[in-house]
């Protein structure tokens, strides 16, 4: 049967028609509608919109839509004892104190139920100490500080800015520095861009906005009581000492304003370099302790949060495959939000209802997907990516047969300058011909592709004439997809041109002021680039869930191995005496990408030949490319990462927001000249070296002919 | 040096308008709001609303609504308050004040407009 | 709106003496309280904002403290020039309100 017949289509039943479909102005309405009062995970008000969205998807015309509930760890502030830092004198009299809450945006003055500012996760605690600036409290910071300063942490509260890395690693870091307390805060430095107003004005962070966020080092877990496994009615528990990821000392956020207060009497030594220097009108100085005069004053902590076992709820949709219906490709992004939610997450879920309606739209048409196509409004995925991973351990045995492919969709938006993409080798070829059938919004593109104005201002460093995708990281609900059950994975939305700033955020991020006005008035007025990114996100599951062969190009997947096995083996090399010493190979590392170069090229040539109209071959050759991700999973995991089991890929150990390359062979080579025992780190390389390897060689073997 | 210099006492009828100015200088006047202020004799302050010069935005207590326009000249940096069908209990010192963003305290005044309503 | 409670509402006291003037909201308003001193033919000053951050060009003897809902202007070895009308106002919701003012008299 040709894909028209198959899939009971009418001419008109394309992509075109699904695409022309999305309307920017349906989006506008779905985000107004989606942020008018706060929707935290665990909360009277996110359970009510996920009823109202499953209602809509019901209405939209999905077959069917569910709610998943589970009882995952939550944490809250505690309402009547708030949280907040303080400078105390010699008599212990609190002479400042930082803010409770920020001030209310314009209009929402009147809004109950605003989470004040906290660190989600964060232990009670009231720790009294002399500060310590630790920069942005990278692995690199702490080792600029202890190694070539020879400033100790042990029994300090360390004060980092936000910025570069996950809030969690910094807060690890510190534990590991021996800290007794973490103070974030937002830099203008990282939160500031310089020439633009502070909200309302404008998209700036005022000096009263602070950025929530977990801080929390799961690793993949899910629910930090029951990881691996499904937080449901029969769940057993751990006790909270044997809890995943939570942190061991109490930790807080503030704003700039604040933040001045503290660091303005920083005495001790002098910032190590101009790479430590903010934007406040302060010194910084590492410490410990103030300055002469105000050297006998502390700072003290006061949290009061409380951990709770809470329920969630996830609405899950299913558009029915009308050929194969037991392979799924899932769009899914969360619902949750620390506050209003403008951009971070409803920017992305008011483009998941859209791409709803309109699959809608066409099956009450009498179209349907060739394939299965699941939606997902995924819960408490500021608390740790826990609605997602908890729905995923609950169908991991479906989703590991039957998974085709994961888009993210959280949001649409972090800046309104151009196209950013991160995915799976597999689908670089789907997302640039995609990109070259879709109009550019940009200005100065007009009637141009998506792709060239994306190729412009955004290049790929190795490839001229085609544009960056960068790795998977983690920090978002695909990461169980990919990191964890090796299912294709992708993400797309509309970035900003802040190449150096790449993991700060936009500067209202989590913050109170991120409304709907927020991207109405500055980011988005047409809703252009939200249209644009839903026909990306759109297009991509169109694509994934109709066409007759996967869109998957695994001689991409080739390339980039090689690329990785490269920059690890350079990696590597900076340290030749011991590679000889200890016999370090990366023989069978190159000799397995050769290999899968070799094969997966003629697996693309069988892929052009084979007989489309014969069913049985149809299915075999696309379950080959549904697996090859699935190929690279080890069961074991990574060390000490267990729910991290891809080879190819991981979230960084230094950074859960980057994406790291083999990242076995990358930890074990990591800091390897200040290992105690060098053998057995050399002995570990070798060994990470022989799993991918392994792993490299053996997805291979999954391209081969089958017999 | 930074001043707000405000125009002189009104004496007006009830019934009737006045429209009293504030001259910024010495600083860029669309980088700040202006805010106005009533005192009435002897008694303590009420916030009557702010005129955004970035944006054109303005705001207005909920008391002085229909009671007080405010409008800035930009060319000029001069702020402008006007207000309507005067009666006995708009006599008052009327204050311009700075402030540097929407969340800030106002960290300059003008001396006062006295307005007296009477007949 | 955010009621202000300001007291005492007279205070005579003499040079090189501590006076403290509080200042009740009706509810929280986290740290964001200023204090203004109002002088005869004089513009009005700006003393603190934020609830302890002391104004440029203010003197160190004028000091805020408080959160929530209960603040405390103190002004330590009372200066001559510091006798004047003295109001606090919140800045963290619009409206903006003001307190009713103390009047610090010499005694």
């Known amino acids: 049967k040709s894909s028209n017949e198959a899939t009971n289509i009418t001419p008109k039943h394309n992509m075109k028609a699904f695409l022309d479909e999305l309307k920017a102005e349906n989006i506008k309405k779905f985000l107004y509608n989606f942020t008018q009062i706060p929707h935290l995970a665990g909360t009277e008000q996110n359970f009510q919109l996920a009823k109202q969205i499953q209602s809509q998807w019901k209405e939209f015309g999905l077959d069917s839509v569910e709610l998943a509930h589970y009882d995952v760890l939550l944490s809250y502030p505690n309402k009547t004892h708030p949280n907040y830092i303080s400078i105390i004198n010699e008599d212990g009299n609190e002479i400042f104190n930082t803010s409770l809450f920020e001030p209310p945006p314009p209009g929402y003055e009147n809004v109950s139920d605003i989470v004040p500012p906290f660190s989600a996760f964060s232990p009670q605690g009231m720790p009294e100490g002399d500060l310590v600036y630790v920069n942005y409290a990278r692995t690199e910071d702490f080792f600029k500080l202890e190694r070539d300063m020879k400033i100790n942490c042990s029994g300090k509260i360390v004060i980092a800015r936000y910025g570069k890395v996950f809030r969690g690693n910094k807060v690890k870091n510190a534990q590991l520095a021996g800290a007794k307390g973490v103070i974030l805060y937002s830099d203008p430095a990282d939160y500031f861009a310089p020439g633009v107003k502070s909200y309302p004005d404008g998209w700036n962070l005022p000096g009263g906005g602070v950025q929530r966020g977990n801080i929390l080092n799961l690793n993949g877990a899910g629910d930090p009581l029951t990881p691996g496994y499904p937080a449901n009615e029969y769940a057993y528990r751990r006790g909270i000492a044997e809890a995943v990821g939570l942190p061991s000392i109490p930790v807080h956020p503030i704003g700039y304003y604040d933040a001045q207060k503290l660091l303005e009497k920083m005495g001790g030594s002098a910032p190590p370099d101009s790479s430590w220097r903010g934007s406040l009108k302060v010194p910084y100085n590492v410490g410990p302790g103030f300055t002469g005069n105000f050297s006998t004053q502390k700072v003290k902590m006061h949290i009061h949060s409380t951990n709770e076992v809470t329920r969630i709820y996830n609405v899950i949709g299913t558009l029915r495959g009308a050929v194969e219906p037991d392979r799924y490709v899932i769009l899914g992004g969360h619902r949750d939000s620390w506050v209003f939610g403008g951009i971070d997450p409803q920017s992305g879920a008011a483009v998941v209802h859209e791409i709803v309606r309109s699959f809608g739209t066409l099956k009450k048409e009498g179209w349907r997907p060739r394939r299965t196509i699941l939606f997902a409004s995924w819960d408490a995925e500021e608390f740790g990516l826990l609605g997602s991973t908890e729905w995923a351990e609950e169908n991991s045995r479906l989703l590991q047969e039957r998974g085709v492919a994961y888009i993210n969709a959280d949001s649409s938006i972090e800046g309104n300058y151009t196209l950013r993409v991160d995915c799976t080798p597999l689908m670089y070829s789907l997302v640039h011909n995609l990109t070259k059938e879709l109009k550019s919004p940009d200005e100065g593109f007009e009637g141009k592709s998506l792709y060239e104005s994306w190729t412009k201002k955004s290049p790929s460093p190795e490839f001229s004439g085609m544009p960056r995708i960068s790795k998977l990281g983690s920090g978002n609900d695909f990461e169980v997809f990919f990191q964890r059950l090796g299912i294709a994975s992708g993400r797309a939305r509309y970035t900003k041109n802040w190449e150096t700033n790449k993991f700060s955020g936009y500067p209202l991020y989590h913050s109170v002021y991120e409304t709907y006005e927020l991207v109405e008035k500055f980011y988005d007025p047409m809703f252009k680039y939200h249209l644009t990114v839903a026909q990306v996100r759109g297009g991509m599951v169109f694509e994934l869930a109709n066409s007759i062969v996967l869109p998957f190009d695994c001689r991409d997947y080739a390339v980039v191995l090689r690329k990785y096995a490269d920059k690890i083996y350079s990696i590597s090399m900076k340290h030749p005496q011991e590679m000889k010493t200890y016999s370090v190979s990366f023989d069978s590392l190159f000799s397995a990408v050769k290999n899968f170069t070799e094969i997966a090229s003629k697996f693309s040539e069988r892929l052009q030949d084979f007989d489309k109209s014969n069913p049985i071959v149809l299915r075999m050759m696309n379950d080959q490319l549904m697996f090859l991700e699935r190929a690279f999973i080890d069961p074991l995991g990574l060390p000490d990462r267990p729910f991290y089991r891809h080879v190819i890929y991981a979230p960084s150990s230094h950074n859960k927001y980057a994406g790291e390359s083999f990242p076995g062979i990358y930890d074990a080579l990591f800091d390897i000249e200040s290992k105690v025992d060098p053998s057995k780190a050399w002995g570990e390389v070798k060994r990470q070296i022989y799993v991918a390897a392994f792993t490299v060689q053996a997805a291979a073997e999954t391209l081969s002919e089958v017999a | 040096e930074i001043q707000l210099q405000q125009s002189g006492p009104e004496l007006v009828k009830p019934g009737a308008s006045v429209k009293m100015s504030c001259k910024a200088s010495g600083y860029t006047f669309t980088d700040y709001y202006m805010h106005w202020v009533k005192q009435n004799n002897g008694e303590s302050l009420e916030w009557i609303g702010y005129f955004n010069p970035y944006n054109d935005y303005t705001r207005y207590n909920q008391n002085f609504n229909g009671k007080a326009t405010l409008t800035v000249d930009k060319s000029s940096s001069t702020a402008y308050m006007q207000l309507n069908s005067l009666t006995s209990e708009d006599s008052a010192f009327y204050y311009c004040?700075?402030?540097?963003?929407?969340?800030?305290?106002?960290?300059?005044w003008g001396q006062g407009t006295s307005v007296t309503v009477s007949s | 709106d955010v009621q202000i409670t300001q007291s005492p509402s007279y205070l005579a006291a003499s040079p090189g003496e501590t006076i403290t003037i509080n200042c009740r909201a009706s509810k929280s308003i986290s740290k964001y309280l200023a204090w203004y001193q109002e002088k005869p033919g004089k513009a009005n000053k700006l003393l603190i904002h934020s609830g302890s951050t002391l104004q440029s060009g203010i003197p160190s003897r004028f000091s805020g403290s408080g959160s929530g809902t209960d603040f405390t202007l103190t002004i330590s070895s009372l200066e001559p020039e510091d006798f004047a009308m003295y109001y606090c106002q919140q800045h963290i919701e619009y409206p903006w309100t003001f307190g009713g003012g103390t009047k610090l008299e010499i005694k």
């Open positions: 004040a700075r402030s540097d963003g929407y969340y800030d305290a106002m960290d300059y």
